[in-house]
Interface confidence: low
């Protein structure tokens, strides 16, 4: 009798009620291997799931997540809400990364900025909520006369007088200062609704929010359940 069942191909099941005849899988069920005594119910992609591949008599349906969600788990067993870059998903929804952390993806958690000094390097570009810091040469590499192995400075090319160099340096400083002022001004205006959270954040002071904002900071404090941000 077992031999009869082993002849049943994928897409069928060995029907004990019909003298071990191979019966096709009923609608919305499948068998992906031969010799099965039952067909498995097809996976249904409902709610936050959407169908990536329809179920057939020989293979299960495959699901994806609808827009605004991403798959978690093997075979997309769970859909998790997307957040913006610079945020992480908490029990209360999407929350901004705490100062000193970043998330460059729409999923996952905020991770601490790289500590450049651990590798003996200096910070070349400051970190943001969305981006890690960029580490540059070590401070020792930048300071003059730090290494006796430093090659001698090349002779100055004609035309590069000290006056021109001074003028260029001064111009650059003024331009950078103006840029910094504009960025700061823009930042203050943009974030006034957020109570200047990242500019004037005080340790362990919870920002007062008149409304529950979706993207308020997820800085969790010691008394909160989920473990605190180290400020």
């Amino acid at each position: 009798l077992q031999d009869l069942c082993s002849n049943c191909p994928a897409g069928t099941f060995c029907d004990n009620n019909r003298s071990q005849i191979c019966s096709p899988c009923p609608p919305n069920s499948f068998s992906s291997a031969g010799g099965q005594r039952t067909c498995d119910i097809c996976r249904q992609c409902k709610g936050v799931f959407k169908t990536r591949k329809e179920c057939s008599s020989t293979s299960n349906a495959e699901c994806d997540c609808i827009s605004g969600y991403h798959c978690l788990g093997a075979e997309c067993s769970m859909c998790e809400q997307d957040c913006k870059q610079g945020q992480e998903l908490t029990k209360k929804g999407c929350k901004d990364c705490c100062f000193g952390t970043f998330n460059d993806q729409k999923r996952g958690i905020c991770r601490p900025w790289t500590n450049c000094s651990l590798d003996g390097k200096s910070v070349l570009v400051n970190g943001t909520k969305e981006r890690d810091v960029v580490c540059g040469p070590s401070p020792a590499d930048l300071s003059p006369g730090a290494s006796s192995a430093t090659p001698p400075a090349p002779a100055r090319e004609p035309g590069h007088s000290p006056q021109i160099i001074f003028f260029l340096a001064l111009t650059s400083t003024v331009v950078l200062f103006l840029l910094f002022f504009l960025v700061l001004r823009f930042s203050v205006v943009k974030r006034s609704r957020k109570k200047l959270l990242y500019i004037f954040k005080q340790p362990f002071m919870r920002p007062v929010q008149t409304t529950q904002e979706e993207d308020g900071c997820s800085c969790r404090f010691p008394e909160e359940e989920e473990g605190g941000c180290e400020l």
Epitope: L72, E75, S77
Partner: antibody
């Protein structure tokens, strides 16, 4: 009854190759992702590799990436682990394990609920 | 990669006593993705708890799991002789790699 039976282990020299097999029965094999987990003598468990039910997605631990290849033949209900460029530190008992809940709507990782008895791989000159 | 640290390394207790095993994650893990296993010498691991607190099929109710975020606990309310073994926690969160804790050995005092 769900059963997983590993084979293919043995003694191999450093730099050599070996292919492990895991024969599955008692469940719809293609509906489950499968994993290989190893345990060096007297040590803890280390996840090695995993493969989705369809075989379309594979995952590896950094320690074996580029050397090991996981695959499956759903028509034969068999999981494989091809191990190349073997090193002494790959010496371990290798287990295959059924990895995830087949009830796909579940929002919960169901753990590795069934394991084989393991097969010993010894890499030594 | 998320690192799981189990404590204590060894727990010496007598049958009938309560065992509390700790598992701490290096970063927050969804409780849906934490499992506990028991392993006896010469045997394959056996799933005890999944989803941090759900008992696997056939596991006695003296085993219970709890915790969230970075701290998880496996409790054996009254140790039976067959419970003396090594216990591992395991996480699967934000895709692979899956990682295991280094294990806690529960031995007879």
């Amino acid at each position: 009854e769900v059963q997983l039976l590993e084979s293919g282990g043995g003694l191999v020299q450093p730099g050599g190759s070996l292919r492990l097999n895991c024969a599955a029965s008692g469940f719809t094999f293609s509906s489950y992702a499968m994993s290989w987990v190893r345990q060096a003598p007297g040590k803890g468990l280390e996840w090695v590799s995993a493969i989705s039910g369809s075989g379309g997605s594979t995952y590896y631990a950094d320690s074996v990436k580029g050397r090991f290849t996981i695959s499956r033949d759903n028509s034969k209900n068999t999981l494989y682990l091809q191990m190349n460029s073997l090193r002494a530190e790959d010496t371990a008992v290798y287990y295959c394990a059924r990895s995830y809940d087949k009830y796909w709507g579940s929002s919960m990782y169901s753990g590795m609920d069934y394991w084989g008895q393991g097969t010993l791989v010894t890499v030594s000159s | 990669e998320i690192v799981l640290t189990q404590s204590p390394g060894t727990l010496s207790l007598s049958p009938g006593e309560r065992a509390t095993l700790s598992c701490r994650a290096s970063q927050s893990v969804s409780s849906s993705y934490l499992a506990w296993y028991q392993q006896k010498p010469g045997q394959a691991p056996r799933l005890l708890i999944y989803g941090a607190s759900s008992r696997a099929t056939g596991i006695p109710d003296r085993f219970s799991g709890s915790g969230s975020g970075t701290d998880f606990t496996l409790t054996i309310s009254r140790l039976e002789p067959e419970d003396f073994a090594v216990y591992y926690c395991q996480q699967y969160y934000s895709y692979y790699p899956v990682t295991f804790g280094q294990g806690t050995k529960v031995e007879i005092k």
